[in-house]
Structures are given as structure tokens and as C-alpha cells.
């Protein structure tokens, strides 16, 4: 018999956690698991419980996590990795829309995330979307072109800036930008 199926690992309420705010990491396997192992990758840190409650996020807790479980002598495959990001480590960038935040359906718009610091990575989030758009950019300004805009692009956007040297330590979010598709 092969390895047991992998568990799921999630961060609640979100894997983007402002410094000093709480977050819970939860490893979910099948019923009746004997032992869970939740580990922080690239370190020697772990715990043998399914739930890790972090009462106040710290820089040192940011990073990649994964979990697995044991039944009898068999270990499961590891979960997909979870990237736990500390936000608010740096000042917020600014987010703007070119030519403007109101765009006609079928038109083009570019969202630009700009910081005065030397960050080389940017992430753009649309409220309600599970994952960010990421864009490496050398010159402290990241452009996210949206070609042929549709009504689905309407919504509230925020961006973050960070460094590839510390990819789990992010800025505070930009002020929200409301994109209106007419």
C-alpha cells in the first residue's frame, strides 16, 4: 500500500497577516488521524498538532509551512505548501490606474503600483479573488495591464510591495482603488 493521501493546510482568516494580528493554521486530514506534524520549512521548527494558533503575527513566523499526518506506521504525503506572509512590515505603496479608474468595457487599463523604496516585487489583489497577481519589476514601479476590460474586472484592488530577498515580508496594502467598468 502506498502513502496516505495528503492533507489540506489553510490559514484562517487569511495567509496575508498584518503584524501583531492573529492567524490560525489548520491541517485537515481524514477522521481518526493518530498524529499530525505541522512544520515551518527552511527551519527546524514544527509542532505535532493539527492547529497552530498564532496570537500575534511576527516577522519570524512568516514563511512556508506544510503538514502531514500519521496513521499507524504510515505517513501521508505532505500537504501543498502554504505561504504565510506578514504584511505591514514596510510602508504602503501607492496604486493608480492609467488612464483612469473608470474604463469602458472593451477598453484597456493599466494598474500601477509604485513605492519609493527599492523593492523588486509587487503583488496586486482584487477583493474577493483568492490569489494575487505577482509582477517582478526593477524600477520600483509595477505595471499590471488589463487588456480588453470586461465587467468582471470591476472591483476593489490593492497592491503590496516586497523584496525577493525576504519574499514573505510585505508592505502594508496600498489604499484601495475602485475600478469601474462602464
Amino acid at each position: 500500500s502506498g502513502p496516505l493521501p495528503k492533507p489540506s493546510l489553510q490559514a484562517l482568516p487569511s495567509s496575508l497577516v498584518p503584524l501583531e494580528k492573529p492567524v490560525t493554521l489548520r491541517c485537515q486530514g481524514p477522521p481518526g488521524v493518530d498524529l499530525y506534524r505541522l512544520e515551518k520549512l527552511s527551519s527546524s521548527r514544527y509542532q505535532d498538532q493539527a492547529v497552530l494558533f498564532i496570537p500575534a503575527m511576527k516577522r519570524s513566523l512568516a514563511g512556508r509551512y506544510r503538514c502531514s499526518y500519521q496513521n499507524g506506521s504510515l505517513w501521508s504525503l505532505p500537504s501543498d505548501q502554504l505561504e504565510l506572509v506578514a504584511t505591514g512590515v514596510f510602508a504602503k505603496p501607492s496604486l493608480s490606474a492609467q488612464p483612469g479608474p473608470a474604463v469602458s468595457s472593451g477598453g484597456d487599463v493599466t494598474l500601477q503600483c509604485q513605492t519609493r523604496y527599492g523593492f523588486d516585487q509587487f503583488a496586486l489583489y482584487k477583493e474577493g479573488d483568492p490569489a494575487p497577481y505577482k509582477n517582478p519589476e526593477r524600477w520600483y514601479r509595477a505595471s499590471f495591464p488589463i487588456i480588453t476590460v470586461t465587467a468582471a474586472h470591476s472591483g476593489t484592488y490593492r497592491c503590496y510591495s516586497f523584496s525577493s530577498r525576504d519574499p514573505y515580508l510585505w508592505s502594508a496594502p496600498s489604499d484601495p482603488l475602485e475600478l469601474v467598468v462602464t
Epitope: K40, S43, S44, R45, Y46, K58, S60
Partner: nanobody
């Protein structure tokens, strides 16, 4: 709110003793490893002694073995560091720190601890 409050520092003569206390609040104390660290003037912070959450296993820096004792009282949410036969070179600010994760290494590493107290000054005069 996570808080660690050290107390028990002060001025002591070489060869004397002090007992430091670290009172914790704002988290489930039983689940956390606790470490004592110190930073002497002009030097880097170093691990002195740590105690795990799971089995109460302890670590001591070589320089303090046989003289320092770490103990935890989960009922009082407090960890103690009994320091005997103190030396002038042990003058430093002593910090306690907490970690919700175990560390599989055999020593206290500053990077493995997430929550820190403000420190208490220990001065050992000759």
C-alpha cells in the same frame, strides 16, 4: 495581547545568586517553548537556557551548565532562571522569549523565538 515580563534582575557581587522570573500572558503558555537570552554591552544576544513545551526538556549554554537552572510553572504562566556563582562577564540585559513551535536543534537560537520581553538588567560586580 502577547506579553512577557521579566523581573528579578539587579546588582549582585561576583559569586552571588539571582532568580529571574518571566511572567507570560496573552497566549496558551503550556504550548510554548520559553528561552532566556542575554545581551552584554557591545555584544550580540546569545541563548542562555531554554525549556520546551512538550516534555520540559532543557538546554543550557556550555558557559552556564551546572550554575544556572531553568524551570517552568505552567499553573502560574511563569518561567524561572536560577543563576548561581555569577561572574562579572555575565553582566547583561536578560530577555525571555517564547515560541509556539518546537525546535529540533539542540540549542537556543534567537531566530526560533517570536515573542520577546523588554529585558531585565543584571549587573555582576567584582
Amino acid at each position: 495581547q502577547v506579553q512577557l515580563q521579566e523581573s528579578g534582575g539587579g546588582l549582585v557581587q561576583a559569586g552571588g545568586s539571582l532568580r529571574l522570573s518571566c511572567a507570560a500572558s496573552g497566549f496558551t503558555f503550556d504550548d510554548y517553548a520559553i528561552g532566556w537570552f542575554r545581551q552584554a554591552p557591545g555584544k550580540e544576544r546569545e541563548g542562555v537556557s531554554c525549556i520546551s513545551s512538550s516534555d520540559g526538556s532543557t538546554y543550557y549554554a556550555d558557559s552556564v551548565k551546572g550554575r544556572f537552572t531553568i524551570a517552568r510553572d505552567n499553573a502560574k504562566n511563569t518561567v524561572y532562571l536560577q543563576m548561581n556563582s555569577l561572574k562579572p562577564e555575565e553582566t547583561a540585559v536578560y530577555y525571555c522569549a517564547a515560541s509556539p513551535l518546537y525546535y529540533s536543534g539542540s540549542y537556543c537560537r534567537e531566530t526560533e523565538y517570536d515573542y520577546w520581553g523588554q529585558g531585565t538588567q543584571v549587573t555582576v560586580s567584582s
